[in-house]
């Protein structure tokens, strides 16, 4: 009995035409939503003039349906037992699951103004940029609609720059009609313990963003893992959103629609400083903002974002050091709401439910040559938004799963 089940599982989790895994892998049967909460700044003038604490109030959720598009350019390579693909990006607004419309306005950091002196550190250049910022009537903060903030708007300051640069700015710009990849993953045909593990991303085995082993692309994309998952295992996966590989550890056993699953959680030490977790030393790439690598809970992903001062954290700076959250008022980190977890069915290794939570922040620093920023007395890592991307196996699929997998084992 057990041998037969194991044999069936091994056959059905292979990523090739005709298997259960392949069908769900090409186009997920799960409806995936991405909820956004925007941090609306309540005291923009006070901050710009007096370098006060930034008072924020989160507004949301604003919900989009994502990951509804099938993988494309799927190519099997029988030589090395891999399958390559790209994942198209798309987002559809869901008004019924949102607190308002895409036209709702928010006061947020001016992304272009904040980034300019970070990207252009030369003082001559900053003088030129300052004149363009003033000419465009831009300031430290701006009011933007949800749609503009997420998906892009023509920036008035950048529109005055005489160089052929992109003048469109948005937290996720460009998104619709773009693809993530190329991913090349092992199909498991020769070795089931490697199924879905990423062999390369964008044609490379390393990211070129981090020094040393931090730069490695480890594990799967978290949608599934090699079968027969044990509680003692550390699940490693790569997330292009945060430009790094990360890991999850066993948290608890739960029942998901009658299916026993293991809940794997991202541990706090994944975001720890090198002082607390020496393994993280290569994720600390600069010494000033990180207070000589003693700060924790934020990840500088600028190298992955064309040098823009983008920092990723958990929502509300959960698991972040006090120095990071001290200049911001209105944050209420909460483990249940703000942590990331994966509910993995241990026999197949399929992720049947997940919640990916992360926050996008922008660093803004005092800049003597930029009038909009010259009154700042300290750097701020400014929260822009946080997101909760969730997916749960549908009732019908769950029944089918129980019949075909867990039911047979019982």
């Amino acid at each position: 009995g057990d041998m037969l089940i194991e044999k069936t599982i091994k056959r059905e989790v292979v990523l090739e035409e005709g298997t259960t895994a392949f069908k769900n892998w090409v186009k997920t049967g799960t409806t995936v939503y991405r909820q956004f909460w925007i941090f609306d700044v309540q005291n923009p003038d006070d901050v710009a003039k007096n370098s006060s604490k930034i008072k924020v109030k989160q507004r949301g959720p604003y919900t989009y349906r994502v990951r509804y598009l099938a993988k494309e350019n799927i190519t099997q390579d029988p030589e090395d037992h891999t399958v390559s693909f790209v994942q198209p990006n798309g987002a559809i607004f869901e008004p019924s699951l949102s607190v308002g419309t895409e036209d709702d306005n928010f006061t947020v950091l001016n992304l272009a103004v904040a980034a300019a002196p970070h990207i252009y550190q030369n003082s001559f250049v900053q003088v030129v940029l300052n004149s363009l910022i003033k000419k465009s009537k831009s300031s430290m903060f701006q009011t933007r609609s949800l749609k503009e903030l997420l998906w892009g708007y023509k920036d008035p300051f950048l529109s005055l720059v005489p160089y052929p640069i992109s003048t469109t700015v948005g937290v996720f710009y460009p998104y619709n009609d773009t693809v993530d990849g190329v991913y090349k993953v092992f199909n498991g045909k020769d070795n089931i313990s490697k199924v879905a593990i990423i062999e390369s991303y964008k044609g490379k085995r390393n990211l070129s963003y981090w020094p040393s082993y931090c730069d490695m692309i480890n594990g799967t994309d978290a949608a599934s893992f090699p079968p027969f998952v044990e509680k003692s295992r550390t699940l490693r996966f790569f997330s292009s959103d945060i430009c790094r590989s990360i890991y999850a550890v066993f948290g608890s056993e739960i029942d998901l629609k009658g299916i026993p699953v293991y809940r794997f959680v991202l541990p706090a030490n994944a975001f720890a400083s090198p002082l607390q977790n020496p393994d993280n030393h290569c994720f600390c790439t600069e010494k000033v903002i990180s207070n000589n690598c003693t700060s924790y809970g934020v990840l500088d992903i600028g190298k992955c974002k064309e040098g823009k001062p983008v920092y990723i954290s958990l929502p509300h700076f959960l698991h972040a050091s006090p120095d990071v959250s001290e200049p911001i008022e209105g944050l209420h980190p909460n483990e249940d709401e703000h942590r990331t977890y994966l509910d993995v069915e241990p026999i197949t290794g399929f992720t049947l439910q997940f919640a990916k939570r992360l926050q996008v922040n922008i660093l803004v620093k005092p800049a003597r040559k930029i009038e909009a920023l010259k009154n700042l007395k300290r750097p701020y890592i400014v929260p822009i938004l946080w997101l909760n991307e969730t997916g749960t196996i549908g009732d019908e699929k769950a029944e089918m799963f129980k019949t075909q997998v867990t039911g047979k084992i019982k």
Partner: antibody, heavy 119, light 112 residues
Framework: DVQLQESGPELVKPGASVKISCKAS????????MHWVKQSHGKSLEWIGY????????GYNQKFKSKATLTVDNSSSTAYMELRSLTSEDSAVYYC????????????WGQGTTLTVSS | DVVMTQTPLSLPVSLGDQASISCRSS???????????LHWYLQKPGQSPKLLIY???NRFSGVPDRFSGSGSGTDFTLKISRVEAEDLGVYYC?????????FGGGTKLEIK
């Protein structure tokens, strides 16, 4: 003082590729755009494109987009231009030139690299 | 593309004379940010071009004050008040207001 030292003359066959280098010294390499300019024999100058070493951002003259690829190696303060699918039309002197600080002028130029494409 | 037309093609002068080179663009060089990115370069025989004037009328550091630039919109002029031997070469105007940035065809300043 600012200096841009370009690689030596190149003689290549049609259809081949070539990579020209420009080593910068005397300033912070990552702070300034680096431009490339073409001068065909006895002719005027043509702007090819630029690269910003800080983040590798590029801007191209559309005419050269499929001909030239601009890259940098910040560790050695060197800018590179690769020219591909070479024809006799690509025979020229190629200059690297430093941006003067965001006012679209070139304040320092390399000595030029002569490229000859001939079978 | 913006076409930059320089006149004359060749300018024979005597040392000590005044020289004037004209540059006309096929469209206005006033950028949407209000600046006019019209610059002048000199290329001496066997050398790389050198910047003389930037943004119509600003002399680059080390450039003698006998060089001056003027103009607006589509019409620009470079003047050399008293030509010296070291001024001989080809003068190019350049526009950086519209991508792709373009150079004029050049004006050769030579001894009469």
């Amino acid at each position: 003082d600012v200096q841009l030292q370009e690689s030596g003359p190149e003689l290549v066959k049609p259809g081949a590729s070539v990579k020209i280098s420009c080593k910068a010294s005397g300033y912070t390499f990552t702070d300034y755009n680096m431009h490339w300019v073409k001068q065909s024999h006895g002719k005027s100058l043509e702007w090819i494109g630029y690269i910003y070493p800080y983040n590798g951002g590029t801007g191209y003259n559309q005419k050269f987009k499929s001909k030239a690829t601009l890259t940098v190696d910040n560790s050695s303060s060197t800018a590179y231009m690769e020219l591909r699918s070479l024809t006799s039309e690509d025979s020229a002197v190629y200059y690297c030139a430093r941006d003067g600080g965001y006012d679209v002028y070139f304040d320092y130029w390399g000595q030029g690299t002569t490229l000859t494409v001939s079978s | 593309d913006v076409v930059m037309t320089q006149t004359p093609l060749s300018l024979p002068v005597s040392l000590g004379d005044q020289a004037s080179i004209s540059c006309r663009s096929s469209q206005s060089l006033v950028h949407s940010n209000g600046n006019t990115y019209l610059h002048w370069y000199l290329q001496k025989p066997g050398q790389s071009p050198k910047l003389l004037i930037y943004k119509v009328s600003n002399r680059f550091s080390g450039v003698p004050d006998r060089f001056s630039g003027s103009g607006s919109g589509t019409d620009f002029t470079l003047k050399i008040s008293r030509v010296e031997a070291e001024d001989l070469g080809v003068y190019y105007c350049f526009q950086g207001s519209h991508v792709p940035w373009t150079f004029g065809g050049g004006t050769k300043l030579e001894i009469k």
